[in-house]
């Protein structure tokens, strides 16, 4: 059970693995479902800038390089904790909230909606 | 800037849009790269459950259904934060804590370092 | 912390079998890939084979397909290397890793390798 407030201490750990945790990031280039990064930044929010995933195409790249329609590029979301001041410019006192961001693309075989 | 130690209220807000968060839950068994989902828990931590997407195969599935080794699955992953207990049990005092979880998977084209 | 416990070398004959055995603990939880790698005298680390720990996929290097079979335990949290039909040119020690990124894992990431076991294949 967790109390409804509580201290924190924002000197952040870092829970590293046995390799490199940048490894990720060019994937993004590599992937038949290619994303790119927007910024979203909000000097209210801890942290202040998260990076948002927008799938390139709407068809997966095939092996010719080429964007399949008969394939979808979706986005992988994950909802994920950040601390929202609060009040409004609050120092020391936050809120903990909840969003909902896409960390990048899968590519996956269309659902097929059938029109009568 | 941010000081040392805050308050939290964890009373949650939830910021997500009207579109259904669990939308992509159906995306780990239909991508090229396919995952499972593997629960995390750990009283120690807030949040307490955290779902880690493990790929299913070394390569990705091709029009076939087979696995196509020429392709690559691999984890798309996101460094989030969350609430370590500090010290252990602590009921209200917490650390912010940076881990790294595997989100999903997605098919990339290999870079061939040691796979001939 | 990975923790990563290799036996089953030895001193064998050419054309001799060994079976290699792999202990692995401290894995994070996105762990789907387990991989055999081997570094003989003189030369760098190089890539053996790969399993998934969810499908039982392999993958193998060039040199070793047909001869060599990996196979896992997930209940242990073990992976073994069957080698068959070896040659002095299979001859050094082998380490076995988690491998994170799956084929895409690059030798020069890993932070913790073990020990490793001596494979020495005489003619």
């Known amino acids: 059970n967790f109390p409804r407030t509580v201290m924190v201490n924002l000197n952040i750990h870092n829970r590293n693995t046995n390799t490199n945790p940048k490894r990720s990031s060019d994937y993004y280039d590599r992937s038949t479902s290619p994303w790119n990064l927007h910024r979203n930044e909000d000097p209210e929010r801890y942290p202040s800038v998260i990076w948002e995933a927008k799938c390139r195409h709407l068809g997966c790249i095939n092996a010719d390089g080429n964007v399949d329609y008969h394939m979808n590029s979706v986005p992988i979301q994950q909802e994920i904790l950040v601390l929202r001041r609060e009040p409004p410019h609050s120092p020391n006192s936050f809120r903990l909230e909840k969003i909902l961001v896409s960390v990048g693309c899968t590519c996956v075989t269309p659902i097929v909606h059938h029109v009568a | 800037n941010f000081p040392r130690t805050v308050m939290v209220n964890l009373n949650i807000h939830n910021r997500n849009t009207n579109t259904n968060p669990k939308r992509s839950s159906d995306y780990y068994d239909r991508s090229t790269s396919p995952w499972n989902l593997h629960r995390n828990e750990d009283p120690e931590r807030y949040p307490s459950v955290i779902w880690e997407a493990k790929c299913r195969h070394l390569g990705c599935i091709n029009a076939d259904g087979n696995v196509d080794y020429h392709m690559n699955s691999v984890p798309i992953q996101q460094e989030i934060l969350v609430l370590r207990r500090e010290p252990p049990h602590s009921p209200n005092s917490f650390r912010l804590e940076k881990i790294l979880v595997s989100v999903g998977c997605t098919c990339v084209t290999p870079i061939v370092h040691h796979v001939a | 912390q990975v923790q990563l416990v290799e036996s089953g070398g030895d001193l064998v004959q050419a054309g001799g079998s060994l079976r290699l055995s792999c202990a692995a603990s401290?894995?994070?939880?996105?762990?789907?890939?387990m991989g055999w790698f081997r570094q003989a005298p003189g030369k760098e680390r190089e890539f053996v084979a790969a399993?998934?720990?969810?499908?039982?996929?392999?993958k193998y290097t060039d040199s070793v397909k047909g001869r060599f079979t990996m196979s896992r335990d997930n209940a242990k949290k073990q992976v073994y290397l069957e080698m068959n039909s070896l040659k002095p040119e299979d001859t050094a020690v082998y380490y076995c890793?988690?491998?994170?990124?799956?084929?895409?894992?690059?030798?020069?990431?890993?932070?913790?390798w073990g020990q490793g076991t001596q494979v020495t294949v005489s003619s």
């Open positions: 401290g894995l994070t939880g996105s762990s789907y890939a």
């Open positions: 890793n988690d491998m994170p990124y799956g084929l895409d894992t690059r030798m020069d990431e890993y932070v913790y």
């Open positions: 399993i998934s720990w969810i499908s039982g996929d392999t």
